[in-house]
């Protein structure tokens, strides 16, 4: 189920790459975030908290990513026209409960000016 389009700027372009921003509520302590391209899982990141509030970050499908207190950024490099597609942030919230899955996304348009190494 698609809950809706992202209500924020999801794609940030720089240096022939794109940062895909996946937000989550900053109250959330334990979650899994997956980046989907169409229906395919490109990347994922799971944050859990153990005893003594020790934080564990795991990735089964590793991408260059960056975690903040309310977002996960996934980075795609060497953009070309094949990257144009629908991208979705698939968030699974574990803690605090209730367990909740949301899918938000948008279409990544690729323009010549955003392609990697276009002047080379």
């Amino acid at each position: 189920e698609i809950n809706g389009s992202a209500n924020y700027e999801m794609f940030i372009f720089h240096n022939g790459g794109v940062q895909i921003l996946c937000k989550y509520p900053d109250i959330v302590q334990q979650f899994k975030m997956q980046l989907l391209k169409g229906g395919q899982i490109l990347c994922d990141l799971t944050k859990t908290k153990g005893s003594g509030n020790t934080v564990s970050i795991k990735s089964l499908k590793f991408c260059h990513s960056q975690l903040s207190n309310n977002s996960v950024s996934f980075f795609l490099y060497n953009l070309d026209h094949s990257h144009a597609n629908y991208y979705f942030c698939n968030l699974s919230i574990f803690d605090p409960p209730p367990f909740k899955v949301t899918l938000t996304g948008g279409y990544l348009h690729i323009y010549e000016s955003q392609l990697c190494c276009q002047l080379k």
Partner: antibody, heavy 121, light 106 residues
Framework: QVQLVQSGAEVKKPGSSVKVSCKAS????????MHWVRQAPGQGLEWMGL????????NYNQKFQGRVTITADKSTSTAYMELSSLRSEDTAVYYC??????????????WGQGTTVTVSS | ENVLTQSPAIMSASPGEKVTMTCSAS?????MHWYQQKSITSPKLWIY???KLASGVPGRFSGSGSGNSYSLTISSMEAEDVATYYC?????????FGGGTKLEIK
Amino acid sequence: QVQLVQSGAEVKKPGSSVKVSCKASGYTFTDYAMHWVRQAPGQGLEWMGLISIYSDHTNYNQKFQGRVTITADKSTSTAYMELSSLRSEDTAVYYCGRNNYGNYGWYFDVWGQGTTVTVSS
Amino acid sequence: ENVLTQSPAIMSASPGEKVTMTCSASSSVSYMHWYQQKSITSPKLWIYDTSKLASGVPGRFSGSGSGNSYSLTISSMEAEDVATYYCFQGSGYPYTFGGGTKLEIK
């Protein structure tokens, strides 16, 4: 139906502590987190903190840090909020509220009836 | 702390009149929720995720906005809408409520 029933009104002396209870029914207690919010007379609402029932993780508003303790007893489906070092400004109605999520954020979907705490010498 | 300023603080409307109240955030937020509180009762979830009506809320209510500015609108005021309405942001810690808009009927 889903219900949060809070303990009765309390009158406390300055410097003492109060412990307010919130008994949940109509749903699986550990499947939701519980927040506490207060409302001083004629004033707006103020978020105090929450507890994740299944993990016991707590998160407090820094304004109350050190004075507020939120706990839960899974066996009785009851959440508690204890506020210490009471002062007259803590006179308020205290509410528990169940945590829920929408597509973008979280909110309180069910509230208790409120517990009036009066701090007076 | 993200301060939410609601305006007007008090307003009155005639039955059938359109009503709009606003909530202005000192820092941008991703979404806003609204609660209705009638005198000496607990608040009730009224609108969540900026524009979604909570269960049982009449269709004459709507919510909109983005960034720093959000609003709650009643298309046609009814007597049962008399209450205080609070906006709430859960986007950034510490989570804050607006001071409320008290809606009365003329």
